[in-house]
């Protein structure tokens, strides 16, 4: 019986056995015209499979039934009889092994093991014709017949509606004449399905429904060409915006041709002096795979202006699964030097072209949407960089993303685009020859853009020296080196072996920079990450100081100060993180302006007051300044003749 | 730049929303059995059956006829009263089980969950494209009907499936029944069967051949009875049905019986396991 | 009162075909099964076959399948028999009965008076 | 074809006597069997349907019975113009047909 693997479906549903057409015959291997037993199952009573479909069809050819039943026959009657082998079917006779009769012990010599009704030991298995496309579809009736050579199923759901759907087990989806609702109820399809002539008679809850076999109509195709790929059977035509059946637009059906029709075209607009490439996208282009275009059969207008067919690049040939469909067509735009700034339409008219198969492609297809647009470049920073080449430049103006293509070119050497938008490119500078001043241009579309822009190549920065060897995030790190101005902005980046920060250094002097730590977020709050860092000057080469680590911020206390005892001359408070980035980053500690020579211990900070502070009545200010950024943490004080302590 | 066009999903060159108005009949209750016939000088029909009553419509779906089932019991109940004076059993409202077209008459045959689920026979007239029903003949003879052997009771109000083939000159109905317990003691419907009409449209002729779920199997073990159909030589009823007498009777699985569609006994009875997957 | 009046006495030729005909009265026409009966002289019934005139249905004895049609005509309430390529062995007299309450086959209760047939060279 | 064989082929009563035709079929038909009157150069004429139903304007001395194989038709009290031809006939299968009949002569 073939497939053992897969999801059981045991459950009939519903069935129907019908003659087959000839295409799902040979998928079958049978001949023509042949009966075969359709049914639609479901995993349980309930319909509700684990995963998988709700429903799905499997197909048995009587002949191949009724072979399976005959062999079965054989193996219980013919000798050798496998020992063991059950007649079956306990439920209405007495069990028995084969060849006995029902109840016999053995056959008498006037009984036959023929003669006595019988349960086929082997079952005949079969795979879902639909390969699970049903999805969740609950098919309730079914009734299969065959058009042309078309086998087609006609299915009743449980939520009201009628599938007619070509019986084909080849196809990744399934091929509809149609999907649709009987009515508003939503009431399950009734199982039994009757014939009557050209029509089915379907039944749903109170209701009796007649439907064509050949569908209901052609309304649900929504384009010319798939209306007219639809089965002969269908009687369906194209009635100039929409598809129906003759006796619906007598006047202007017709089953002949298509228009090409224009879904999108990329890109949306172009520089009114320069070139184009032009995609595009739509339908009823050309009907050909390879997309080979006869001559003079495509004529494609902007505006006034001609669009010159290009062949298609056989690289960007994609497959297209047969379930998708989309045409590309690439033409060359020259506008015309008659040709306006503004919006415009892009024109597609296919005429002259050799006839499909199911229909040739004749008409014309307008999609507006395109501008003509001149591109004006007003600003570009910096004008200079490093000799390497790599510093970031920024042009600024309008209509710069227009068109297919551009280039900034930085002495006839073309500046590598990052970003490109509507007012504003991106590109990273080629490497200078020389230390210079050279031409900079930027052409759209291959015309060049008004404007005259120099640009100026300096000597490398050259870093020497990275300090200190750790931080945290904004701490500062100070850069040492030659020409460090050379650059528009030195980068400072940390790397912990997974991933990289990096920070911009604010320009300063040729040999000395002070720049800030990158945001980096430190996990573990008592710990710290190792990690290279690293500083370079756009292209020139970089310096990377190695076993950097990277701390945990530290934390000021935020609760006011405990007054001092009078036996007391030294101020004692918590700063969580301080002690740890102590050789990281300066640290003063102020007590009404006078320093005070701070210990450590773990998280406390130890402050001796300085012999020479004298604390008012309103007491002094403690300040601790952090790597220059100054925080007041409260005053001290000493309690009052009352006890009462003083402080703010 | 390569810019490539977006796909377009097969399923946009169709919508599946569009709203189609096919003709239709509202049969005043739920449909329980719909059969349609053809004729061979351009008549045609479709027998729409619910609670009670049988619709006759024409070929466009306009009603034509339409004759009460039920209850029976009642007065009002016209295939009833061609079983002659009653009563003819318990009262009650008639769900129709079967309905099927006997091709050698051509006739219509109704049966009912009620009256012991006997069938009637209604002449097919033709007038112009649309049929009529003739007045019912009452396919039971009292006389050769009890409740342990009643060739005349057909239908199951558990459902049943019925197929008619013509051998020779005489019309045999083969029938399937689901059966239970309660069902099975009632005027003892079978599981399969295979009943020939009389001539003279009295009955079924009794000696019928069947097969039956074992009394001990009753409880536990039933058969549903989804499709029946006549192809070749053979008749096949398509079952759902525990796929073991001793294990878990909710354990289930499809078969396929075969029955000789030329000879009318049960001798070659075959049933065979169909098994169906979904391989992703 | 149901009466079923036949054509009268044929003499006919061997080979050649004969029609009689049997118009009823006194009840509704379509609603009955008309069958046809043959009795050799001096012989038993022999049953040919019926008609429904109300959906002219009809069946025969594998016998006289070839050799009888049936047919109706619903307008003058008259049903026919045409009898093909005769031969002496047809020489009998043919009666045209309606099915009394129960169809198709069941027992015969009105019968017309016979129209004897003669083939004879 | 089931063959219904009507014994005996003639029967010769007196008036008044009580007379029973038989009908055996070749195989079981339930109760669809019916007699028939022939009177010479008549049509036939119902008697009984069914093996022992009754058909109005029948005189009450006819009476049938049996079932499956074995039926009989009895005149309980013979009158003169009983004097005719009786067939059977089985409405069980197709074709319908009739035995070979039975004479009624009156001595």
């Known amino acids: 019986g073939a497939p053992e693997g897969g999801q059981p479906y045991p459950v009939l549903r519903v069935a129907h056995s019908a003659p087959v057409g000839a295409q799902l015959a040979t998928e079958l291997s049978i001949a023509e015209g042949q009966e075969v037993l359709f049914g639609v199952f479901v995993t349980g009573k309930d319909g509700g499979p684990g995963v998988g479909p709700n429903s799905v069809v499997c197909a048995f050819p009587i002949d191949l039934l009724d072979t399976l039943i005959d062999e079965g026959v054989e193996r219980c009657c013919e000798s050798p009889v496998h020992p063991g082998l059950r007649r079956g079917l306990d439920f209405f006779q007495s069990p028995s092994f084969c060849p006995n009769p029902p109840g016999l012990e053995a056959l008498s010599p006037n009984t036959s093991c023929r003669h006595f009704p019988l349960l086929v030991s082997s079952s005949f298995s079969r795979v879902d014709l639909f390969n699970g496309l049903l999805g969740p579809v609950q098919v309730t009736a079914l009734y299969v017949t065959r058009l042309d050579n078309v086998t087609v199923a006609h299915m009743g759901t449980m939520d009201g509606r009628i599938l007619q759907v070509e019986l084909v087990r080849s196809l990744n989806y399934l091929l509809y004449v149609s999907n649709f609702s009987l009515g508003d109820s939503g009431q399950p399809v009734q199982r039994d399905v009757s014939r009557l002539g050209d029509h089915l008679l379907f039944a749903s809850g109170d209701q009796v429904f007649q439907v064509p076999i050949q569908g209901p109509g052609c309304r649900h195709f929504l384009t010319c060409g798939r209306c007219l790929r639809a089965w002969h059977f269908m009687g369906c035509g194209w009635c100039g915006n929409m598809c129906g059946q003759q006796k619906e637009c007598p006047g202007s059906w017709q089953q002949d041709h298509c228009p090409p029709k224009l879904t999108e075209f990329h890109p949306h607009s172009g520089p009114l002096r320069g070139s184009t490439r032009l995609t595009l996208c739509g339908s009823n282009f050309y009907l050909h795979p390879s997309g080979l275009v006869p001559e003079g059969t495509h004529q494609v207008t902007v505006g006034q202006s001609p669009c010159r067919p290009l062949p298609k690049d056989s690289s960007k040939l994609r497959p297209v699964p047969r379930k998708d469909f989309v045409e590309e067509f690439e033409c060359e735009l020259e506008p015309l030097g008659t040709q306006a700034v503004g919006p415009t339409n892009v024109s597609l008219t296919v005429t002259n072209m050799p006839p499909g198969k199911h229909f040739r492609v004749d008409g014309t297809s307008v999609l507006r949407g395109f501008s003509f647009m001149e591109p004006v470049l007003i600003a570009v920073q910096p004008l200079f960089g490093p000799r390497a080449g790599g510093t970031c430049l920024t042009l600024e103006g309008q209509s710069l993303s227009v068109g297919t293509s551009r280039a900034v070119l930085v002495n006839g050497t073309e500046c590598l685009l990052a970003r490109v938008s509507e007012g504003q490119l991106l590109c990273a500078t080629p490497p200078g020859a020389t230390v210079a001043s050279v031409p900079l241009s930027l052409q759209v579309g291959g015309a060049q853009v008004p404007g005259s822009w120099t640009f100026q190549y300096r000597e490398d920065p050259v870093v020497l020296s990275i300090s200190p060897n750790c931080g945290y995030i904004n701490s500062h790190i100070t850069i040492c080196g030659q020409h460090l101005t050379s650059a528009w902005h030195l980068v400072l980046s940390f790397h912990d072996g997974l991933r990289a920060v990096e920070s911009r250094c604010e320009r300063q002097l040729p040999e000395q920079q002070l720049c800030r730590l990158p945001e980096y977020v430190v996990r573990d709050p008592q710990g710290w990450v190792a990690g290279n860092l690293s500083a370079r000057g756009d292209g020139a080469a970089g310096f990377t100081l190695p076993g950097f680590r990277f701390l945990p911020p530290p934390h000021p206390p935020s609760a006011n100060l405990v007054p001092l005892k009078p036996e007391e001359h030294a101020i004692k408070f918590e700063y969580i993180g301080l002690g740890a980035v102590a050789d990281c980053v300066g640290i003063n500690v102020t007590v009404g302006g006078e320093s005070c020579q701070h210990e450590f211990r773990g998280d406390m900070v130890v402050c001796p007051l300085p012999p020479s502070l004298q604390l008012g009545q309103d007491g002094a200010p403690l300040q601790v300044c952090v790597d220059g950024e100054c925080h007041i943490l409260g005053r001290v004080v000493r309690p009052g003749p009352d006890g009462v302590p003083q402080s703010t | 730049e390569d810019w490539q066009c977006p796909r377009t999903p097969y399923a946009a060159s169709r919508d599946f929303d569009v709203k189609y108005v096919v003709p239709s009949f509202s049969a005043g209750g739920l449909v329980q059995a719909m059969v349609t016939y053809e004729g061979d000088r351009n008549e045609s029909a479709v027998f729409v059956a619910i609670r009670n009553r049988l619709h006759v419509l024409g070929p466009d779906l306009k009603s034509v006829q339409s004759l009460a089932t039920g209850p029976a019991g009642d007065p009002g109940c016209q295939t009833c009263a061609a079983c002659g004076p009653g009563p003819h059993g318990p009262p009650g409202d008639t769900d129709t089980k079967v309905l099927v077209l006997d091709p050698a008459l051509p006739a219509l045959v109704s049966c009912g969950s009620s009256l012991q689920g006997r069938c009637f026979l209604h002449d097919l007239e033709p007038q112009g494209t649309a049929v009529h029903l003739a007045a019912p003949a009452c396919l039971f003879s009292a006389h050769h009907n009890r409740p342990d052997d009643c060739p005349d009771c057909v239908a199951s109000p558990l459902g049943t499936r019925v197929t008619v083939v013509e051998q020779g000159q005489a019309s045999y109905f083969y029938v399937a029944s689901s059966l239970d317990a309660a069902v099975a003691a009632s005027f003892s419907p079978r599981s399969v069967s295979i009943r020939r009409l009389k001539a003279d449209a009295s009955g079924f002729a009794p000696g019928f051949v069947a097969l039956s779920v074992l009394p001990k199997h009753l409880v536990s073990y039933s058969i549903e009875y989804v499709h029946s159909f006549h192809t070749g030589a053979f008749v096949y009823f398509l079952t759902v049905q525990p796929a073991s007498v001793t294990d878990d009777p909710s354990a289930l699985h499809t078969r396929l019986a075969r029955l000789s569609a030329t000879e009318p006994e049960l001798g070659d009875y075959r049933e065979l396991v169909l098994d169906c997957r979904f391989a992703p | 009162e149901v009466q079923l009046q036949e054509s009268g006495p044929e003499l006919v030729k061997p080979g050649t075909s004969v029609r009689i005909s049997c118009k009823a009265s006194?009840?509704?026409?379509?609603?009955?099964?008309m069958h046809w009966v043959k009795q050799r002289p001096g012989q038993g019934l022999e049953w040919i076959g019926y008609i429904y005139p109300g959906n002219v249905n009809t069946k025969y004895n594998e016998k006289f399948k070839g050799k009888a049609t049936l047919t109706a005509d619903k307008s003058s309430s008259t049903a026919y028999m045409q009898l093909s390529s005769l031969t002496s062995e047809d020489s009998a007299v043919y009666f045209c009965?309606?099915?009394?309450?129960?169809?198709?086959?069941?027992?015969?209760?009105?019968w017309g008076q016979g129209t004897a047939v003669t083939v004879s060279s | 074809d089931i063959v219904l064989t009507q014994t005996p082929a003639i029967l010769s009563v007196s008036p008044g006597e009580r007379v029973s035709f038989s009908c055996r079929a070749s195989q079981s038909i339930g109760t669809s069997i019916h007699w028939y009157q022939q009177r010479t150069n008549g049509s036939p004429r119902l008697l009984i349907k069914?093996?022992?139903e009754s058909i109005s304007g029948i005189p009450s001395r006819f009476s049938g019975s049996g079932s499956g194989t074995d039926f009989t038709l009895r005149i309980n009290s013979v009158e003169s113009e009983d004097l005719a031809d009786y067939y059977c006939?089985?409405?069980?299968?197709?074709?319908?047909?009739f035995g070979g009949g039975t004479k009624l002569e009156i001595k």
């Open positions: 069914y093996a022992s």
């Open positions: 009965a309606r099915l009394g309450y129960y169809r198709y086959g069941g027992a015969m209760d009105y």
């Open positions: 006194g009840y509704t026409f379509t609603s009955y099964y």
């Open positions: 006939q089985q409405s069980d299968s197709w074709p319908t047909t």
